[in-house]
Interface confidence: low
């Protein structure tokens, strides 16, 4: 069974999928639709890299621009480096400015909802 067939079978169960499963799916040419992506757990989406989201969505990645103000896309954008977001060619704004250091302080993030940034 290839990636697309597998995705069709599991599509209705994906809402609660953990990050690891999403990372695995991104390697299987599934082209997840935006409606499914928007239903994913925010905490599962946040750790995904720009490259992983691009692979996960395929051509549907274009839809991120229309959803940039909505969760989980909004929160995911805040976690990405701006220069990585720029590679999508979508004009997504709000990423971590180039030259900033991201500290993965989970308690800080849990309290504030945003990653902790140190200036250049």
């Amino acid at each position: 069974m290839n990636g697309s067939e597998y995705f069709v079978k599991i599509q209705s169960f994906l809402g609660g999928a953990p990050t690891e499963d999403l990372k695995a799916l991104s390697q299987q040419n599934v082209s997840m639709d935006l409606a499914t992506f928007m239903k994913l757990r925010t905490d599962a989406v946040l750790p995904l890299t720009v490259a992983e989201v691009q692979k996960l969505l395929g051509p549907h990645v274009e839809g991120l621009k229309a959803e940039e103000r909505h969760r989980p896309v909004r929160d995911w954008i805040l976690r990405q480096r701006q220069d990585d977001l720029d590679t999508l060619g979508l004009g997504l704004q709000g990423g971590i400015p180039n030259g900033y250091l991201v500290l993965d302080l989970s308690m800080q993030e849990a309290l504030s909802g945003t990653p902790c940034l140190l200036g250049p």
Epitope: E5, N29, S31, K65, D86, G89, G91
Partner: antibody, heavy 120, light 107 residues
Framework: QVQLQQPGTELVKPGASVKLSCKAS????????MHWVKQRPGQGLEWIGN????????KYNEKFKSKATLTVDKSSSTAYMQLSSLTSEDSAVYYC?????????????WGQGTLITVSA | DIVMTQSQKFMSTSVGDRVSVICKAS??????VAWYQQKPGQSPKALIY???YRYSGVPDRFTGSGSGTDFTLTISNVQSEDLAEYFC?????????FGGGTKLEIK
Amino acid sequence: QVQLQQPGTELVKPGASVKLSCKASGYTFTSYWMHWVKQRPGQGLEWIGNIIPSNGGTKYNEKFKSKATLTVDKSSSTAYMQLSSLTSEDSAVYYCSPHYYGGSPGFAYWGQGTLITVSA
Amino acid sequence: DIVMTQSQKFMSTSVGDRVSVICKASQNVGTNVAWYQQKPGQSPKALIYSASYRYSGVPDRFTGSGSGTDFTLTISNVQSEDLAEYFCQQYNSYPLTFGGGTKLEIK
């Protein structure tokens, strides 16, 4: 509602270039990819490429990479496609269509199309 | 490139009948398929996206089905205004590609 204005016809000479326009209204022009599609008389549809107006990022069908150049003018919400070194094979109707429907790359809205006739 | 094949170039049907337009993809495209209707001298009109979801305003006599490589557009209770050409399109991967079209003729 979404509207896409395209000139009706263009008569051009072999070897010349032509710049087609597509003026969009009824949605946030900069947020959605604009696609271009070719249809030769009595034939099927071919995807040429697309452009995201927010930063001018483009994707092209390899077949049209040396034929078409996509640009936008954000101030007038207009997308352009320049076709170069025209031959009779380029005689066709060219449509613009924004990716603007729930994150699906299906083409929900189409311009009326511009008929290009290449003739000496 | 993914090739979308509509092997029937023409189909003939009568008002009130049910007709199925078939589209086959050269490789698996999941449910990333759209269907369009094009009447003579007009732009294409979107009917179906994600293989089975109707765009708003599309009559419910148009139904899309299928996944993987085999897709069907079914028109039940065909009306005279359904005289048109029907195209499938995949958007699973770039370049986006269309089927060659199936012309529906009303007897």
